[in-house]
């Protein structure tokens, strides 16, 4: 039976995809055949074949970036170290271990789902401008996050969510494979508006919130505060 596991990694970090026999297991390098590949596309990630130190069949995206330890293999640990994780690594990986002395019997089969995450930048909310006499427009920008974010606009007066019909979100996949988001909010002009833009990263359970206030008395200052709330908020930046 194939074991199933999940692991999470930040973009740019190193991650271990676990594939190991029970403690106390012992293997010989000249007896085990180990294959790591992606489950869907069957891309060759790395492998160990006795008496073959060449890894010429490894896909170029993983060469010198996906490695197993011979020392670990002797102890039944066929885990994969994936260095410098990228968003493109978010997929299912399959580890298969066979023993030659057991007639190429399957010793271990593990499927590891890798979830990749990256922190979005602290949102920047542009100063409001008036396309018309009775309307205000705010723009909120946040970049270099993963996975695709959710964007919410908040009425800071009572912390209520504004109607999503009032916002227009554009999400770009940038050159690094990370997401940039621009959200434009259009609301009716009122004497004093205190709103916030919230970028939610579901995988990291992280909300980044930035406030913007309009009125006769706008004293702008920056501050970043830790502000955990029920939505799992970890970092909040408030401008008021």
């Amino acid at each position: 039976d194939t074991q199933e596991k999940e692991v999470r990694a930040m973009v740019g970090s190193d991650v271990e995809l676990s594939c190991a026999c029970p403690e106390g297991s012992r293997f010989d390098l000249n007896d085990v055949y180990v294959y790591w590949q992606t489950s869907e596309s069957k891309t060759v990630v790395t492998y160990h074949i006795p008496q073959n130190s060449s890894l010429e069949n490894v896909d170029s995206r993983y060469r010198n970036r996906a490695l197993m330890s011979p020392a670990g293999m002797l102890r039944g640990d066929f885990s994969l170290r994936l260095f410098n994780v990228t968003p493109q690594d978010e997929q299912k990986f399959h580890c298969l271990v066979l023993s030659q002395s057991l007639g190429f019997q399957e010793v271990l089969s593990v499927e590891v789902t890798l979830h990749v995450a990256a922190n979005f930048s602290v949102p920047v909310v542009s100063a409001p401008h008036s396309p018309s006499q009775d309307e205000l427009t705010f723009t909120c920008t946040s970049i270099n996050g993963y996975p695709r974010p959710n964007v919410y606009w908040i009425n800071k007066t009572d912390n209520s969510l504004l109607d999503q019909a009032l916002q227009n979100d554009t999400v770009f996949l940038n050159m690094r494979g990370l997401y940039d988001v621009v959200s434009v909010l259009r609301i009716a002009r009122t004497p004093s508006v205190n709103i916030g833009c919230c970028i939610e990263n579901v995988l990291l359970q992280q909300n980044l919130t930035v406030g913007s206030q309009t009125g006769n008395d706008i004293g702008e200052r920056d501050k970043i505060t830790e502000n955990p709330v029920s939505t799992g908020e970890k970092n909040a930046a408030t401008w008021s």
């Epitope: 390098l29 000249n30 008496q51 330890s69 670990g72």
Partner: antibody
């Protein structure tokens, strides 16, 4: 050039403890697995312990399992070996050695000059 | 545990001569065998790994061959600095083990 310098050896009574250090320079310490290997006087070499490049995994020879602890401080480029419950048969020159590969192949490509540990009452 | 037996225990040769050192494993270690040189009062030095790959900076007169259980280290023409003890080591099985050494001395 790669340099490994061991320290902390000396004479110690059976049952007591000792901590060896190995200061590394001339290479990116945090990118290599590291080992301790020992050599009893006039005898051959015996592998003792290994630690992964990031300290995440450690393995030991059966003869020292449960008594010795290998560790590293990558910010200080230093490898350690904490030796407890020392026995007369632990008397040896202890070498720290660098593994050839980040993922620990069990090939020792650079060695320190060694530090002598004598366990005697 | 794999036992590595080196022969001869001592090899007496003159500078310029060819040295042939043997290492036999108690069971197959494939090609996962290394050779080290150790001079008196010094640390070992890696010469050959995975049976036949010369380590960085090792002169071409050192060569390794063999696979399975029988391995050979050859020094094609002995230089004065080559007189030392030579150890083989396997990494195919747990634990990693060394041979007892072959001493190459000046005849």
């Amino acid at each position: 050039q790669v340099q490994l310098v061991e320290s902390g050896g000396g004479v110690v009574q059976p049952g007591r403890s000792l901590r060896l250090s190995c200061a590394a320079s001339g290479f990116t310490f945090s990118s290599y697995g590291m080992h301790w290997v020992r050599q009893a006087p006039g005898k051959g070499l015996e592998w003792v312990a290994v630690i992964w490049y990031d300290g995440s995994k450690k393995y030991y020879a059966d003869s020292v399992e449960g008594r010795f602890t290998i560790s590293r401080d990558n910010s200080k480029n230093t490898l350690y070996l904490q030796m407890n419950s020392l026995r007369a048969e632990d008397t040896a020159v202890f070498y720290c050695a660098r593994d050839l590969n980040i993922m620990v192949w069990g090939i020792f490509d650079y060695w320190g000059q060694g530090t002598l540990v004598t366990v005697s009452s | 545990e794999i036992v590595l037996t080196q022969s001869p225990a001592t090899l007496s040769l003159s500078p310029g001569e060819r040295a042939t050192l043997s290492c036999r494993a108690s069971q197959s270690v494939s090609s996962y065998l290394a050779w080290y040189q150790q001079k008196p009062g010094q640390a070992p030095r890696l010469l050959i790994y995975d049976a036949s790959n010369r380590a960085t900076g090792i002169p071409a007169r050192f060569s390794g061959s063999g696979s399975g259980t029988d391995f050979t280290l050859t020094i094609s023409s002995l230089e004065p600095e080559d007189f030392a003890v030579y150890y083989c080591q396997q990494r195919n099985n747990w634990p990693w083990t060394f041979g007892q050494g072959t001493k190459v001395e000046i005849k």
